[in-house]
Interface confidence: low
């Protein structure tokens, strides 16, 4: 594989990076953009042809402690008549996010970053049909 | 801060809240098997509200590559494969936490950052406003 040519510029080494023990990283959990708000269309979880419900999971040893998960309400999709059409499928849409896990080992505490898969909502798809010979 | 249950047998010096700055192990525990939404499913093509995935790369962030969904149509795809404008394709957005290098370019010093990503699209019945 060839590296694309992007000139000869290099990042400058920062003058002062915090000293970090080997195998660790320093993490400031004061969140940048903490007050940012989602501006999704209103009630899309109910108006969708693949509607979903929300469940809040709570874990006091996780930061953030609250993670919201979506679950599709139906296997099929809702048609124009408001009935479930099982020739189509409601499927979950997922996204990874990071959380900080606090672990107690005896009286000492350690922190671990964790990737968590969040189900964000659902979408209606045409099913993949496998024909058996 | 977040309140943490304390082991009753431990000294009282332990803070009940998450401290502002923590040292974390470099190994990120992955509870998931699929990591690339582009590879993990073809829902973006099979959906009645299909979307395209756009690559957003930032070397100062972890993960450095995030895929952003953009709905292909204003309407939704009907049974005949045509766009039905009586329905709307809308993005599903999610706040996620990422790591931002702080100070910039430092290899092992980060701050949590909340970013808003469009993960996919869903087909909804429009809200119709009737004018009196």
């Amino acid at each position: 594989r060839k590296i694309p040519k992007v000139g000869h510029t290099f990042f400058q080494k920062p003058e002062s990076c915090p000293p970090v023990p080997g195998g660790s990283m320093k993490l400031d959990i004061g969140i940048i953009n903490e007050n940012q708000r989602v501006s999704m269309s209103r009630n899309i979880e109910s108006r969708s042809t693949s509607p979903w419900n929300y469940t809040v999971t709570w874990d006091p040893n996780r930061y953030p402690s609250e993670v919201v998960q979506a679950q599709c309400r139906n296997l099929g999709c809702i048609n124009a008549q408001g009935k479930e059409d099982i020739s189509m499928n409601s499927v979950p849409i997922q996204q990874e996010t990071l959380v900080v896990r606090r672990k107690h080992q005896g009286c000492s505490v350690s922190f671990q970053l964790e990737k968590v898969l969040v189900t964000v909502g659902c979408t209606c798809v045409t099913p993949v049909i496998h024909h058996v010979q | 801060g977040i309140t943490i249950p304390r082991n009753p047998g431990c000294p009282n010096s332990e803070d009940k809240n998450f401290p502002r700055t923590v040292m974390v192990n470099l190994n990120i525990h992955n509870r998931n098997t699929n990591t690339n939404p582009k590879r993990s499913s073809d829902y973006y093509n099979r959906s009645t509200s299909p979307w395209n995935l756009h690559r957003n790369e930032d070397p100062e962030r972890y993960p450095s590559v995030i895929w952003e969904a953009k709905c292909r149509h204003l309407g939704c795809i009907n049974a005949d494969g045509n766009v039905d404008y009586h329905m709307n394709s809308v993005p599903i957005q999610q706040e996620i936490l990422v790591l931002r290098r702080e100070p910039p370019h430092c290899p092992n010093s980060f701050r949590l950052e909340k970013i808003l990503v469009s993960v996919g699209c869903t087909c909804v019945t429009p809200i119709v406003h009737h004018v009196a």
Epitope: R1, I3, P4, V6, G7, H8, T9, F10, F11, Q12, K13, P14, V20, G22, G23 | L26, E57, P59, E60, R61, Y62, P63, S64, V65, L99, R101, H105, C106, P107, N108, F110
Partner: nanobody
Framework: EVQLVESGGGVVQPGGSLRLSCADS????????MGWFRQAPGKEREFVAA????????YYADSVKGRFAISRDTARNTVYLQMNSLKPEDTAVYYC??????????????????WGQGTQVTVSS
């Protein structure tokens, strides 16, 4: 202070071989892509080879392809550059660099911020 230490340079005849090592004693860059670069007298620093954090993705400059091989030993926190069929034009100070994108992928040559002190390689008859 983050430290990358190169070793293995020296004087070698054309057609000879050398193996350079880059030690990351503090384990600062286990999750970063690493690269080898070189700088000949009076010239700009140029990209030679790079390897992803996992070691399964490698990139080479056209001028060294087929002659040089980059590898990493994660247990020893060391990155190697095996240089075979050396030519006089390979003479330079060789630097090891760490890429600053945390997820360990190799992509561009312009975001390496951490460097070793360099090791001299001279190819001469």
């Amino acid at each position: 202070e983050v430290q990358l230490v190169e070793s293995g340079g020296g004087v070698v005849q054309p057609g000879g071989s050398l193996r350079l090592s880059c030690a990351d004693s503090e384990r600062s860059f286990s999750f970063n892509a690493m690269g080898w670069f070189r700088q000949a007298p009076g010239k700009e620093r140029e990209f030679v080879a790079a390897i992803s954090a996992t070691g399964d993705d490698t990139y080479y400059a056209d001028s060294v392809k087929g002659r040089f091989a980059i590898s990493r030993d994660t247990a020893r926190n060391t990155v190697y550059l095996q240089m075979n069929s050396l030519k006089p034009e390979d003479t330079a100070v060789y630097y090891c660099g760490a890429r600053v994108n945390f997820d360990g992928t190799v992509s561009y040559t312009n975001d390496y911020a951490y460097w070793g002190q360099g090791t001299q390689v001279t190819v001469s008859s």
